[in-house]
């Protein structure tokens, strides 16, 4: 039975040209996290595997940085980065847990400041 829950940063906004940290946290389970996949819509951005560490997708390697922790840092944001992001926790023996984050990338003067996990 899957007892765990995923906490995420929820809906966040950031400035065009800036950076943002996407962060998820799995709690309420003793299941072992074997791998975390980060996806944007249908595209895989990065993998963090317990044995091998990070793999950043070739098409994102210049704009995505691993961490902190199991999180992911998106850099040089553009308006096209607006959308849903998913952290997919592969665990044993529970199975798969998925968290959702919605990122809105705004023009510099419009972006809200102080969003949790946002890099100034």
């Amino acid at each position: 039975m899957m007892t765990g829950t995923i906490e995420t940063t929820g809906n966040i906004s950031a400035e065009k040209g800036g950076s943002i940290i996407l962060q998820c946290h799995l709690s309420s389970t003793t299941a072992q996290v074997t791998q975390v996949n980060w996806e944007q819509q249908d595209q895989l951005l990065a993998i963090c595997n317990a044995d091998l560490g990070w793999h950043i997708s070739p098409s994102f390697k210049d704009r995505v940085a691993p961490g902190p922790g199991l999180g992911l840092t998106l850099q040089s944001l553009t308006v096209n980065d607006t959308g849903e992001y998913f952290c997919i926790y592969h665990t044993y023996p529970d199975g798969t847990y998925t968290g959702r984050i919605f990122l809105e990338v705004l023009e510099s003067s419009v972006a809200e400041h102080g969003a949790r996990f946002q890099i100034p």
Epitope: T34, N37, E39, Q43, L44, I47, D51, L52, G53, T96
Partner: antibody, heavy 120, light 107 residues
Framework: QVQLVQSGAEVKKPGASVKVSCKAS????????MSWVRQAPGQGLEWMGI????????SYAQKFQGRVTMTRDTSTSTVYMELSSLRSEDTAVYYC?????????????WGQGTTVTVSS | DIQMTQSPSSLSASVGDRVTITCRAS??????LNWYQQKPGKAPKLLIY???SLQSGVPSRFSGSGSGTDFTLTISSLQPEDFATYYC?????????FGGGTKVEIK
């Protein structure tokens, strides 16, 4: 040119161990992950595991956990795959193969294969 | 582990035919799928990576498509040297796994 040269055919008795080598040349050895794949006679391909030649980290398929050990020697640009407690079902051709980018990608360069026969 | 199911397991075709092989994953694997060609007694050869990217040196008659769970390898006009066995492989989640293979034979 880029190539992987594997050690020669082996005949082993059940319960014994075998160590297959794979020598890389023509590229920077530590920049590419290496996978091992086997193929039993008349059967399909079976992924065994992967090693990072740079740091030595490994990940093995559950089926082989506890029986397989993958290592590397950076001074000779060689990776090794040792399989212990051999049984007749381990009779197969064993291939090493270079991963083209990171660890989650296609295997673009393959060794010629090493035939391992397990027979009493 | 993610299961990869290929269909058909074998097919007969003639030179010049358009051939389609499908691969289905037991869960979504984004576009993290590779296709390989293997001829008897030889090591496999990478044809397609990332579901649709053609590996350097591979003829353009080979193409791949799909995302999520359903993928296709297409040979637009089968050539004599294309008679072989084709395998799909997912690299979305470790352990990476192969499909059972599709043998393309001469009709």
């Amino acid at each position: 040119q880029v190539q992987l040269v594997q050690s020669g055919a082996e005949v082993k008795k059940p319960g014994a161990s075998v160590k297959v080598s794979c020598k890389a040349s023509g590229y920077t050895f530590t920049s590419y992950y290496m996978s091992w794949v086997r193929q039993a006679p008349g059967q399909g391909l079976e992924w065994m595991g992967i090693i990072n030649p740079s740091g030595g980290s490994t990940s093995y398929a559950q089926k082989f956990q506890g029986r397989v050990t993958m290592t590397r020697d950076t001074s000779t640009s060689t990776v090794y795959m040792e399989l212990s407690s051999l049984r007749s079902e381990d009779t197969a051709v064993y291939y090493c193969a270079r991963v083209r980018y990171g660890y989650a990608d296609g295997m673009d360069v393959w060794g010629q294969g090493t035939t391992v026969t397990v027979s009493s | 582990d993610i299961q990869m199911t290929q269909s058909p397991s074998s097919l007969s075709a003639s030179v010049g035919d358009r051939v389609t092989i499908t691969c289905r994953a037991s869960q979504s694997i984004s576009s993290y799928l590779n296709w390989y060609q293997q001829k008897p007694g030889k090591a496999p050869k990478l044809l397609i990576y990332g579901a649709s990217s053609l590996q350097s040196g591979v003829p353009s008659r080979f193409s791949g498509s799909g995302s999520g769970t359903d993928f296709t390898l297409t040979i637009s006009s089968l050539q004599p040297e294309d008679f072989a066995t084709y395998y799909c492989q997912q690299v979305y989640h470790l352990p990476f796994t192969f499909g059972g293979g599709t043998k393309v034979e001469i009709k």
